[in-house]
Interface confidence: low
């Protein structure tokens, strides 16, 4: 910042002026056939439905156009359990202030008008998110974009919740089978500047991105004001639970974020130095030892996001949380006076839902997660039993070409395989995406095998061999080549926002192994 | 290292256009907002126009329905359409993108001169 020096980087804050309407956002194109029709009600699907078989013209990699049915309660139940050990959670969350369902906008504007009666300050009205969530649909969405950059089909994308906040005169429906953009409000920003430390450098910058591999945001854990003494009288107190941390993830950066309203009246012209401290001990009859972690000046005038580096003591809050007692943060003003945070324009929890504090940490876990894997074999089985007896029953996503006479196998390619949110009834703790195209591979791997099957030397290999010896060598297999990751925006059981990258998740490219 | 470089400043006379864009020198991973500062000397650099991601986009009251903020994803490049200048809207006008992880990055700034 040329000429500027240290104090330009207080002086402008990303979204302070992000609160007025903004209008409907455009629509995204319509979902693929799958997407469409899973978002229709079908839990896991390709394409068509039973009844109605549609076959877009296949591509050399991918294929469309295949039946399935609503999965039972009891393969709902174990489908969730699969998905859940693959997310790495022990269980369903179940948060206290989760999503609810979108109602209908008239029956939506009517409850709103109800609740705003009724819910205390500083509650979002059910379906609405607060400031923590919104900065994380923030980073989901940069997260998506980058996805979509590089290179994914818009089958592969994942689809966005509709039901963000944005006022129900805001929103445009969507022909049947478009996904809903991310259509909200947004006050959220980063604040500029990375407190006075020099800026990581970009290539830091990818390496700390590709690194990340969960974030989370937490809600301030403080109801009630602490009776500090004269000193600390105007002191603010913070704490966020951190003991709820996966093992194995390592905090590389961790922020606490806080609103700055503009300030007018007597203050209109003063400058402002917020300091954030970790509480170190609390006494019982004198002030609490702290420990300074970062600092802001900023101006009366400013509004917006202000950010303070916390690293530190994040890590030592996951390593050991008794020693967790919170922040404190204080505000003086150029005179040395010590004043209210409220005086300063910052909101507190008694403020507007969508400029509550709250805290953001970046991990990367430092062991790999192993999956407990369940006895599958056993289900497979009493699957295989099921299948004979109850031959109507389409019991799993079955290709149209499987139904064929004439029994040809088509050759090994992606077929489309979406996995939806909704219908496992997730809605309410996960926030985006509404589900997503996992994909799988199936085919032949016959000879001659064809440049686009992406076979490897040995398979080809391997084919000849089965050529001379079929009952000794089997064909190559059809298997994924390529996989994508997919990030997942969800609420914990304590109302924790967390952004999670699962690696491996989307079938780009099949081939032949 | 990444640079912004903004482009289309000059000189114009009150009630006219200018287009200014700014592009990255190559993909910043993790953008989540792109906008516009300007500064006058002597005051502080405010916000002029912010889009996210999500292609939200916001206006300094100042600029309402005079000035476009727009982008194009794939070349990475944020654009301010301004239209029916005033003099007060000379200034040094500043392309800045957020990105994940503490990063903003700024470009070094385009005057503009709008004479009455």
């Known amino acids: 910042m040329p000429g500027l020096g240290r104090r330009a980087q207080w002086l402008c804050w990303w979204w302070g002026l992000l609160c007025s309407c903004c209008g409907p956002p455009p629509l995204r194109p319509p979902l693929p056939a799958a997407a469409a029709a899973a978002a229709g009600g079908q839990l896991l699907g390709d394409g068509g439905s039973p009844g109605r078989t549609e076959q877009p013209p296949p591509s050399p990699q991918s294929s469309s156009g295949f039946l399935y049915r609503r999965l039972k309660t009891q393969e709902k139940r174990e489908m969730q359990k699969e998905i859940l050990s693959v997310l790495g959670l022990p269980h369903r969350p179940r948060p206290l202030h989760g999503l609810q369902q979108p109602q209908p906008p008239a029956l939506r504007q009517q409850e709103e008008q109800q609740q705003q009666q009724q819910l205390p300050r500083g509650e979002p009205p059910p379906g609405r998110l607060k400031s923590a969530p919104l900065f994380m649909l923030d980073l989901y969405n940069a997260l998506s974009a980058d996805n979509d950059e590089d290179g994914a089909s818009e089958g592969e994308r994942q689809q966005s919740w509709p039901h963000e906040a944005a006022s129900s005169s805001q929103r445009r429906q969507p022909p049947p089978g478009a996904a809903h953009p991310l259509n909200r409000k947004s006050l959220l920003a980063p604040g500029s500047g990375s407190g006075g430390a020099s800026p990581l450098t970009s290539a830091q910058d990818s390496a700390f991105l590709n690194d990340a591999d969960m974030v989370m945001s937490f809600v301030n854990l403080v109801e009630y004001d602490k009776e500090f003494s004269p000193r600390q009288r105007h002191h603010k107190e913070f704490k966020f639970n951190l003991s709820q941390i996966p093992e194995g993830e390592v905090v590389t950066a961790a922020e606490f974020r806080i609103y700055k309203d503009c300030v007018m009246g007597s203050f209109k012209n003063q400058t402002f130095l917020i300091s954030i401290y970790q509480v170190l001990q609390e006494h019982q009859h004198r002030d609490s030892d702290l420990f300074l972690l970062d600092t802001r000046v900023v101006w009366a005038s400013e509004e917006g996001w202000l950010e303070f580096d916390i690293t530190a003591t994040s890590n030592l809050w996951v390593v050991t949380p008794q020693h967790n007692m919170g922040l404190q943060l204080s505000v003086v003003t150029r005179d040395g006076v010590h004043v209210h945070p409220r005086a300063a324009g910052l909101v507190g929890r008694d403020g507007p839902y969508d400029k509550q504090p709250f805290m953001v940490a970046f991990f990367k876990v430092s062991e790999v997660h192993v999956r407990t894997t369940r006895s599958a074999s056993s289900r497979r089985r009493q699957q295989s039993r099921n299948r004979s007896t109850q031959s109507q029953d389409v019991a799993r996503v079955s290709s149209a070409s499987d139904y064929n006479s004439s029994e040809l196998k088509t050759a090994c390619r992606k077929h489309e395989l979406y996995v939806s949110f909704q219908d496992l009834g997730w809605q309410d703790w996960i926030i985006a995406p509404k589900g997503y195209a996992a994909n799988y591979c199936d085919g032949e791997c016959s000879f001659p095998l064809n440049a686009h099957m992406n076979a490897t030397n040995h398979a080809i290999v391997q084919t000849l061999v089965h050529l001379m010896n079929p009952e000794y060598v089997p064909k190559p297999c059809c298997a994924p080549t390529k996989l994508n990751a997919i990030s997942v925006l969800y609420f914990d059981d304590n109302s924790n926002v967390i952004l999670k990258k699962y690696r491996n998740m989307v079938v780009r490219a099949c081939g032949c192994h | 290292e990444v640079q912004l470089v903004e482009s289309g400043g000059g000189l114009v006379q009150a009630g006219g256009s200018l287009k200014l864009s700014c592009a990255a020198s190559?993909?910043?991973?993790?953008?989540?907002?792109m906008g516009w500062y300007r500064q006058t000397p002597g005051k502080e650099r405010e916000l002029v126009a912010a889009?996210?991601?999500?292609?939200?986009?916001n206006y300094a009251d100042f600029v309402k329905g005079r000035f476009t903020i727009s982008r194009d994803k794939v070349n990475n490049t944020v654009y301010l359409e301004m239209n029916t200048l005033k003099p007060e809207d000379t200034a040094v006008y500043y392309c800045?993108?957020?990105?994940?992880?503490?990063?903003?990055?700024w470009g070094q700034g385009t005057r503009v001169t709008v004479s009455s």
């Open positions: 800045k993108q957020s990105a994940w992880g503490r990063n903003d990055y």
């Open positions: 190559r993909r910043i991973s993790g953008i989540y907002a």
């Open positions: 889009i996210t991601t999500s292609d939200h986009t």
